[in-house]
């Protein structure tokens, strides 16, 4: 628009002046005036601001508390927060990853559809016909039933979603 109908994108209005915002990684010390420019200062160690801003205080970096099963995935900078993730075998309870829980195991009759990550839990699926899982596991998929035919054997006991088939020798034909 000509002329402008607001301060420019990286500015804010104060006392009839369009002042520059502070860039990411810096905090506001003093607003600009008719005589002076906006004064900004870099955030201190373990602090950050991730947007153009007029904040007078920087935010503290997130603490990845090992007592909650957390560890640092990416160290924070003056412009970014620390990113936490969970220790091996655990996953975040929320998007913010403020605490961790143990990965869920898939019960017998269920197999792992998707292995858990630091941010998502195990996804289980029921074993379909022809497949089984006889263990409680966070890694095992459903296994296919043994094929008795390929071993020249016959099914002596049908399989279920929790058990494999039992194969046995074929009955000999009597004379």
């Amino acid at each position: 628009p000509e002329p402008p109908t607001a301060c420019r994108e990286k500015q804010y209005l104060i006392n009839s002046q369009c002042c520059s915002l502070c860039q990411p990684g810096q905090k506001l010390v003093s607003d600009c005036t008719e005589f002076t420019e906006t004064e900004c200062l870099p955030c201190g160690e373990s602090e950050f601001l991730d947007t153009w801003n007029r904040e007078t205080h920087c935010h503290q970096h997130k603490y990845c508390d090992p007592n909650l099963g957390l560890r640092v995935q990416q160290k924070g900078t003056s412009e970014t927060d620390t990113i936490c993730t969970c220790e091996e075998g655990w996953h975040c309870t929320s998007e913010a990853c403020e605490s961790c829980v143990l990965h869920r195991s898939c019960s017998p009759g269920f197999g792992v559809k998707q292995i858990a990550t630091g941010v998502s839990d195990t996804i289980c699926e029921p074993c379909p016909v022809g497949f089984f899982s006889n263990v409680s596991s966070a890694f095992e998929k459903c296994h296919p039933w043994t094929s008795c035919e390929t071993k020249d054997l016959v099914v002596q006991q049908a399989g279920t979603n929790k058990t494999d088939v039992v194969c046995g020798p074929q009955d000999r034909l009597r004379a």
């Epitope: 000509e2 002329p3 402008p4 109908t5 420019r8 990286k10 369009c18 520059s20 906006t38």
Partner: antibody, heavy 125, light 107 residues
């Protein structure tokens, strides 16, 4: 204090291109639009256009469309104005100027509060 | 394009004189007008913006008035350092044009 320091004088042949730089200091470069104005010897001031240093988006006066390119490098707080297919009537002092916006009576009023020292571009065969 | 016509183009005055420069716009520009002072070999310097607001650091002998199509720059008591060329600029419609200038010389 705010300073806009421009590159030195240039002599170019007709048909050539020239690139003038304007290094800003004393303020947050990406926070203020930068304008380019030229002045032919003994003549008045002519507005060429502006660049948003944050996004890099330029707006050019129609007269210079297709011949002028305004760019910036935020890492070194520098704006550039390149003029191509130079003619003798492009001989002028080229200025960069920072935009200031004042708010009053419900309106936003722009003006140019800081100017570079100027760069003389001479186009001669 | 909006045309700005300054009058006079040339003005001869003495130290202590009251000087008035007029700037007329070819169409209404509300108060989107600025005044600049330029000395030989130097960049322009902002004096007045929003038609009548004095830029910080500019002596109070300078004042601006007007709205719409007619504007004036007044120097209440001309000082030796005021001998220069003065330009008005409209900032409401692209291109943001300048007046042709008014040169103030010592009588």
């Amino acid at each position: 204090q705010v300073q806009l320091v421009q590159s030195g004088a240039e002599v170019k042949k007709p048909g050539a291109s020239v690139k003038v730089s304007c290094k800003a200091s004393g303020y947050t470069f990406a926070g203020y639009y930068m304008y380019w104005v030229r002045q032919a010897p003994g003549q008045g001031l002519e507005w060429m256009g502006w660049i948003n240093p944050d996004s890099g988006a330029p707006t050019y006066a129609q007269k210079f469309q297709g011949r002028v390119t305004m760019t910036r490098d935020t890492s070194i707080s520098t704006a550039y104005m390149e003029l191509s297919r130079l003619r003798s009537d492009d001989t002028a002092v080229y200025y960069c100027a920072r935009e200031k916006i004042y708010y009053g009576s419900g309106n936003y009023y722009p003006s140019f509060d800081y100017w570079g020292q100027g760069t003389l571009v001479t186009v001669s065969s | 394009d909006i045309q700005l016509t300054q009058s006079p183009s040339f003005l001869s005055a003495s130290v202590g004189d009251r000087v008035t420069i007029t700037c007329r716009a070819s169409q209404g520009i509300s108060s989107y007008l600025a005044w600049y002072q330029q000395k030989p070999g130097k960049a322009p310097k902002l004096l007045i913006y929003a038609a009548s607001t004095l830029q910080s650091g500019v002596p109070s002998r300078f004042s601006g008035s007007g709205s719409g199509t007619e504007f004036t720059l007044t120097i209440s008591s001309l000082q030796p350092e005021d001998f220069a060329t003065y330009y008005c600029q409209q900032l409401t419609s692209y291109p943001w044009t300048f007046g042709q200038g008014t040169k103030v010389e010592i009588k």
